[in-house]
């Protein structure tokens, strides 16, 4: 089976590498634009040189490419705690990122949000925070995990997850508790 | 005490049209960022959109793009988001929530309310 390819795929593949096909005229290959810069006028003819002009402003193109506009710089959210770690140029665009001890938490392909790492107070960093993920916390003895927090098995409800690890202590309490009656 | 209600949902063809509202309390609307999330049927939570508090540059989910607004009155404490142009794939129960800002995880979010796009 020959796998599907989009037009623009099929056009490029008769031409060789770094060169696309005329749209009007599929015996001619012309050159590609290169890298921020974008496709103003196709190739009057072979060997002629395709017509590309410079990105203006606030747009870029990361590759070379027959597009017939540049793509608009991305803009870091601020909403999401983002901050800029450098800006747009015509050949590359915004690069986006969070400040100093907060990790990326990617709700989809192409939404970040900055969050703080965890310090693991009551508890001690089994692994350290990354760009992508937060720290891990091993709580001490008497604490258990909720949300990458290390709580006090005071806090810990029977119906919980927390009661496994919290048990020694729910049974202590329950001891003392109970040598308490005469 | 935070409180988000969602409503607007039903069934309706492919190619048609809702509204949903997300009535909001117990918190000020017009500081926080609000956001549409979404669960097809057994499927996992997915991002729709998000409005910053000033209603500029809304963020959308590329599957939704060109198809849904989200907007926001902050005088009646009201989250929208209109869908245009429904796809069977869109049909799933629409929450609106907070965004979140200790972590990973949504602390405040509406009960929900079930769009079914089929003919």
């Known amino acids: 089976l020959v796998p599907h390819l989009g037009d623009r795929e099929k056009r490029d593949s008769v031409c060789p590498q770094g060169k696309y096909i005329h749209p009007q005229n599929n015996s001619i290959c012309c050159t590609k634009c290169h890298k921020g810069t974008y496709l103003y006028n196709d190739c009057p003819g072979p060997g002629q040189d395709t017509d590309c002009r410079e990105c203006e402003s606030g747009s870029f193109t990361a590759s070379e490419n027959h597009l017939r506009h540049c793509l608009s710089c991305s803009k870091c959210r601020k909403e999401m705690g983002q901050v800029e770690i450098s800006s747009c140029t015509v050949d590359r665009d915004t690069v986006c990122g969070c400040r100093k001890n907060q990790y990326r938490h990617y709700w989809s392909e192409n939404l970040f949000q900055c969050f703080n790492c965890s310090l693991c107070l009551n508890g001690t960093v089994h692994l350290s925070c990354q760009e992508k993920q937060n720290t891990v916390c091993t709580c001490h003895a008497g604490f258990f995990l909720r949300e990458n927090e290390c709580v006090s098995c005071s806090n810990c409800k029977k119906s919980l997850e927390c009661t496994k690890l919290c048990l020694p202590q729910i049974e202590n309490v329950k001891g003392t508790e109970d040598s308490g009656t005469t | 005490e935070v409180q988000l209600s969602e409503s607007g949902g039903g069934l309706v063809q492919p190619g048609g049209s809702l509204r949903l509202s997300c009535a909001a309390s117990?918190?000020?609307?017009?500081?926080?960022?609000m956001v549409w999330v979404r669960q097809a049927p057994g499927k996992g939570l997915e991002w729709v959109s998000h409005i910053p508090p000033d209603g500029q540059d809304p963020f959308y989910a590329d599957s939704v793009k060109g198809r849904f607004t989200i907007s926001r009155d902050n005088s009646k404490n009201t989250l929208y988001l209109q869908m245009n142009s429904l796809r069977a794939e869109d049909t799933a129960v629409y929450y609106c929530?907070?965004?979140?800002?200790?972590?990973?995880?949504?602390?405040?979010w509406g009960q929900g309310t079930l769009v079914t796009v089929s003919s």
């Open positions: 929530a907070l965004l979140p800002n200790r972590g990973p995880w949504f602390d405040y």
């Open positions: 117990g918190f000020t609307f017009a500081h926080e960022t």
